[in-house]
Interface confidence: low
């Protein structure tokens, strides 16, 4: 039987190394050998050799770009010979190079890196295309940037200041379909700048009899600020709106400060500074004690979307694009230092990982609209990041025992023992030697009437309080219907 005609010839030119071609079928059943023929130097020269497998590497001396080569494979066995079709290969279009070497990555002004690199091969002036990929060290998402006709220095711009990046580079010949593998990764930090503007918030204490009140300012690095950003300290400036008197407090090293302000409206600003200068001001207006603030939130809901707690709200005006979300355990004695807060921009939802909140704890969550530097009226709800079954069941009593009726009453479980929102109560009752029956009522009910009981019969009754996580039974009590 004649050998199968060689087909699907595929060649890769490993630059400055060899031209490797493979073909099908990869395995012949009978004893097949091959003669491979390469025509090169634009058809002026030939090279032939024997091959025992469906693959052959032509030596470097036969593959010198720029060239268009042709490859033909002849399969032969004891029964005869079969030639493939002739295939033509533009060497540069199938050239594959080694991963390049990054020689240096230098941070230079204006949030950029200058990358100096070199190929492992001598590319002999053929135009190259490069691709840089980069990510911040704590991210897994790569951004890729193409450099057409790239030289051996690339400038990567549009980065974030004082941020640690991981970079890698690959390249190909302009006309090649094959990229090199990525270079080894390099890690560098962009140059430091003045600090980013801070996120600023406040806790307002009730005013005293004179209208004076304590205002605790809280601030932190904004979400978009570089992770590595260092700050030497903070400056506060504030003034009453009806006055030109400016008060300054310098070189604060904590991220909170308590002011005693008179009853009128004030403007407060906080800046941070480092060796290069100071940040822009973060400004907040503290309203007059008697001022009515605006209400811009229509509704709000909280729900669990594992592994997150999600809070959504509806705004009544689109102009608000910044919101402050506050959350603190309901049992906290005071807002400071138990309060946590976060600034949210351009969205009307907020999420937090459930693990970052205490399980089985009721949180008060408030959202404040911020318009310019003015803070509006908050909308507040309660939520649990994770619910559990109540720590104990309801304390139960039986009242109004009749011939066939009884009223079961119970006390609300103390909040500290609920471990979640009580969804409902289930009253279980069972006549002596009889079947267990039950009635479920909503979470607002604290009593339940049992009817159609059997006269002069002993009953056991207990009440189960349920959260999303499950129920907990109260103590069983016994009663006997009248005769």
């Amino acid at each position: 039987v004649l050998p199968t005609k060689p087909e699907n010839i595929s060649c890769v030119f490993y630059f400055d190394r060899n031209l490797t071609c493979t073909w099908r079928p990869e395995k012949e059943t009978n004893d097949t050998s091959y003669i491979v023929t390469l025509t090169y130097s634009y058809g002026k020269s030939n090279y032939s050799d024997n091959a025992t497998e469906a693959s052959y590497s032509f030596p470097r001396s036969c593959a010198m770009p720029p060239d268009i080569c042709s490859v033909e494979v002849q399969a032969q066995n004891g029964d005869g010979k079969v030639k493939s079709d002739i295939t033509y290969w533009h060497l540069i279009s199938i050239a594959k190079t080694e991963p390049p070497i990054i020689l240096s990555v230098n941070p230079i002004c204006n949030r950029m890196f200058q990358i100096q690199w070199k190929p492992r091969e001598k590319t002999r002036g053929f135009p190259l295309v490069c691709m840089l990929r980069f990510r911040t060290v704590n991210s897994s998402h790569w951004t890729e940037v193409n450099f057409e006709n790239c030289k051996q220095v690339c400038n990567l711009t549009g980065l974030q200041a004082f941020t640690e990046y991981v970079l890698a580079l690959r390249f190909r010949f302009n006309d090649s379909r094959y990229w090199s593998k990525w270079s080894k990764e390099e890690t560098r930090v962009t140059m430091e700048e003045v600090p980013h503007v801070l996120d600023l918030w406040r806790i307002l204490e009730p005013a005293d009899m004179n209208g004076d009140r304590k205002v605790r300012l809280l601030w932190k690095k904004a979400r978009g600020a570089p992770v590595l950003e260092k700050t030497f300290g903070y400056h506060i400036q504030y003034f009453a709106e009806n006055s030109t008197n400016l008060t300054e407090i310098n070189n604060i090293t904590t991220q909170q400060y308590e002011l005693l302000l008179m009853s009128q409206a004030h403007s407060v600003s906080v800046t941070s500074f480092n060796s290069l200068g100071k940040s822009q001001e973060a400004i907040l207006r503290i309203p007059d004690v008697h001022e009515k603030t605006f209400q811009y939130i229509k509704s709000m809901k909280a729900y669990i979307a594992e592994p997150l707690l999600v809070v959504n709200w509806q705004s009544s005006i689109p102009a608000v694009d910044t919101w402050i979300v506050e959350w603190l355990p309901e049992a906290a004695m005071s807002k400071f230092p138990a309060l946590s807060w976060e600034s949210v921009s351009q969205v009307t939802n907020w999420t937090i990982e459930q693990d970052k909140l205490k399980p089985f704890t009721c949180y008060n969550i408030s959202v404040y609209p911020v318009l310019g530097h003015r803070v509006g009226e908050p909308y507040s709800i309660q939520a649990y990041a994770k619910e559990g079954t109540p720590l104990k069941g309801p304390e139960t009593r039986v009242e109004n025992i009749g011939l066939r009726t009884a009223t079961i009453t119970w006390k609300e479980i103390p909040k500290s023992a609920r471990n979640g929102f009580i969804n409902n109560y289930t009253v279980f009752y069972q006549a002596e030697g009889g079947k267990e029956l039950s009635k479920t009522v909503n979470s607002h009910a604290l009593q339940c009437d049992l009817e159609s009981l059997t006269r002069r019969t002993s009953y056991t009754v207990w009440v189960m309080a349920s959260t999303r996580a499950g129920g907990t039974n109260g103590v069983r009590i016994n009663f006997k219907t009248l005769s």
Partner: antibody
């Protein structure tokens, strides 16, 4: 031609430190990683870590974390390996080896194509 | 880190073929390098990228790698091939080098 010349043999007491040097010539020192590999008497090869001579970045084997420090001086094309808190089982020949530029079309990683002749470090009280 | 297992010794008569194995869990998915170390000398890279030879290494040295075993094959063995041979891989998650325990090739 490409070569790596290492410093001479050392005898140290337990608890001391040793610093071995490796001077590169015949190629661009900052272009290729430098690895350190040791071999205890009659034992096999043990990889210790690498340094990127360009950036100074390092990567140490878990076993040597906290005891090994790899540095370089690009002005004299020299890599250094310092091992502290020496113990008798640190007695070994310490090699520096360049990570190669042999074309390896399918590979992201390379072999070590040029080795120093080794530095014998003896730790004995 | 991957663990690479080599036989401690392999013996072969001159002119025969020596096969030195390097076992490791799914080693076929990694790139394997082989080094030859003659007594008192520094190691020499003899195979890189599973199957390729650096310049100056005789064609008698070849490599293969698939599944859980990589193999260094030395055909037409000569007395001068007597040496220790080590396989090596890079652990791609840590970029740490890992060597096999080494195999002493004895030419009978």
């Amino acid at each position: 031609q490409v070569q790596l010349v290492q410093s001479g043999a050392e005898v140290k007491k337990p608890g001391a430190s040793v610093k071995v040097s490796c001077k590169a010539s015949g190629y661009t020192f900052t272009g290729y990683y430098m690895h350190w590999v040791r071999q205890a008497p009659g034992q096999g090869l043990e990889w210790m870590g690498w340094i990127n001579p360009n950036s100074g970045g390092t990567n140490y084997a878990q076993k040597f974390q906290g005891r090994v420090t790899m540095t370089r001086d690009t002005s004299i094309s020299t890599a250094y390996m310092e091992l502290s808190r020496l113990r008798s089982d640190d007695t070994a020949v310490y090699y520096c080896a360049r990570e190669d530029v042999v074309p390896a079309a399918m590979s992201f990683y390379y072999g070590m194509d040029v080795w120093g002749r080794g530095t014998l470090v003896t730790v004995s009280s | 880190l991957p663990v690479l297992t080599q036989p401690p010794s392999v013996s072969v008569a001159p002119g025969q073929t020596a096969r030195i194995t390097c076992g490791g869990n799914n080693i076929g998915s990694k790139t394997v390098y082989w080094y030859q170390q003659e007594p008192g000398q520094a190691p020499v890279l003899v195979v890189y990228d599973d199957t390729d030879r650096p310049a100056g290494i005789p064609e008698r040295f070849s490599g293969a790698n698939s599944g859980n075993t990589a193999t260094l094959t030395i055909s037409r063995v000569e007395a001068g091939d007597e040496a220790d041979y080590y396989c090596q891989v890079w652990d791609s998650s840590t970029d740490h080098g890992v060597f096999g325990g080494g195999t002493k090739l004895t030419v009978l």
